[in-house]
Amino acid sequence: QTSVFPPEVILPRGGSVKVNCSASCDQPISLGMETPLPKKEILPGGNNWKMYELSNVQEDSQPMCYSNCPDGQSSAKTLLTVYWTPERVELAPLPPWQPVGKNLTLRCQVEGGAPRANLTVMLLRGEKELSRQSAVGEPAEVTTTVPVGRDDHGANFSCRTELDLRPYVLKLFENTSAPHQLQTFDLPATPPQLVSPQVLEVDTQGTVVCSLDGLFPVSEAQVSLALGDQKLNPTITYGNNSLSAKASVKVTAEEEGTQQLLCGVMLGNQTQETRQTVTIYSFPAPNVNLTKPEVSEGTEVIVECEAHPRAKVMLNGVPAQPPGPRAQFLLKATPEDNGRSFSCSATLEVAGQLVHKNQTRELRVLYGPRLDEKDCPGNWTWPENSQQTPMCQAWGNPLPQLKCLKDGTFPLPIGQSVTVTRDLEGTYLCQARSTRGEVTREVTVNVLSPRYE
């Protein structure tokens, strides 16, 4: 009978092993080993045994020991099991962005590795095991499907192989793929909310606000705002899960008409858009014309208001007759009209909205100077030693200068409190003077002496 030792060997690929072949008789006729592996007899052997060194063992093999004894021929095999770790452990690329709530399929490919019975493939999230499967096929492919939540954003996924040769070899061989970071996103199905003026006047500034809630991760979201061909430059404010993009928009005459305002929020590989129509219009303020802005009293003045051809005007609150873009009226200028405002209000309908423009002109009426009995009484009688305030008001535009002099040398303190003395008595010549001329009026002051009983 032929014996082999060891009967089983686990060795690394390319490794060497010593195998002892022995015969049961003392003097075998022949004793040897049959193997395709490179072998070397280790001398000296014994009468009934030989030691062989097998090298460069690349794959599982069963070398056979044989012996020929007087009682017959026999053989025995040793089982060589080769182990090696996989040459490639690779996690298939993850999608650049993974929507929250959608399942993610993780796929791992393992090339090589033996013995396969001892080779396990694991899919990991960080260090947490998601799936453990045997390696089957070449290359071995292992898949698992996992639900994706917001907390998976930024998580590392990898694939690990375990070659467990225990208890034969007190070793656990691990190979781990390069990790892949997952980027998750959550873009709600609702479109962004767009707040903007429905109508916008040429050369004026409007504000557009686009906002969306329920975004994750909000910092990765991008906003695109455009009015027609004009890209807007918004200022973006981020909340916890929301963003608000605010932009100023100024439109020119070339953009007059209907324009599309577009707000797009891009996150991951998805976009949510909102479109709105904005009507750009041109509406100059109406013109208020006075035949002359400064006239002398008694002059006829034509007040005219003219606006946009499609506008309807009101002049000083009175609508044009028939309703339209022009209105006018005639007046004879009086002092009461000095400083009078003529206001023209024009109304234009733009995209169902009424827009208003006003223009005001002031009329200056030149009149006077005037000194009337009502405002400058011709006679004052005052008790001696009493406190009095001489009043004399000159009227006119431009406002006249006023002086009241007695004998050209004594002024009467108009509008000032005076103590009445004999010196105050007399006739004063009051003169009101402006660039339009001069008027005079005599004012007499009488001083009553106190009666002594």
């Epitope: 200068q401 004998d407 040398t409 004594f410 002024p411 303190p413 003169q431």
Partner: antibody, heavy 117, light 110 residues
Amino acid sequence: QSVEESGGGLVKPGGTLTLTCTVSGFSLSTHAMGWVRQAPGKGLEYIGIIGSSDRTYYASWAKGRFTISKTSTTVDLKITSPTTEDTATYFCVRDPYDSFDDGYRLWGPGTLVTVSS
Amino acid sequence: AYDMTQTPASVEVAVGGTVTIKCQASQSIYSYLSWYQQKPGQRPKFLIYDASKVASGVPSRFKGSGSGTEFTLTISAVQSDDAATYYCQQAYSSSNVDNAFGGGTEVMVK
């Protein structure tokens, strides 16, 4: 409209001197005329005024020593018994008490009176 | 008597500076006060009337204020051309007067 003084010059103490102010471009019946003097290196000194009604008013120190009178186009200042202290430039002024703008504050260029024996 | 007291008699001021001249009436003259500027060898130039009204052609640097018995002439951003003697004159009473003019203030600009 203008005013101009004349009649200044050298006068002996105790004599009599009359200065004349000739006006043009306005009527003395509607304007008061005053006389102001200024001794060499000294300040302005008010002498008196003649009103539009011909009434005269004098500074307290000038009463009795000066007399103001007028015709239709001239205003005279008569200095009685001048002393060396009356040596000064004498100005004729229209409407010194008017409260209108400067067109009514016409000053003549002044005439120099020197009192010396 | 309606007499005028003017202070100071003289003042020195740097170009660009501000000068203030005061004038006091012995009794109320309301707002009937005028200010004059006089340069050597020239007749007085009318600056301000009715205490605060600036005569035409006078720079706005000249400002008058006051009423009753206390009056002030302020010259701001003084220029070298402002070197002169300044007089106040009461324009209220032509009788009962010693002198209708203040004694004058000589302004020297350095």
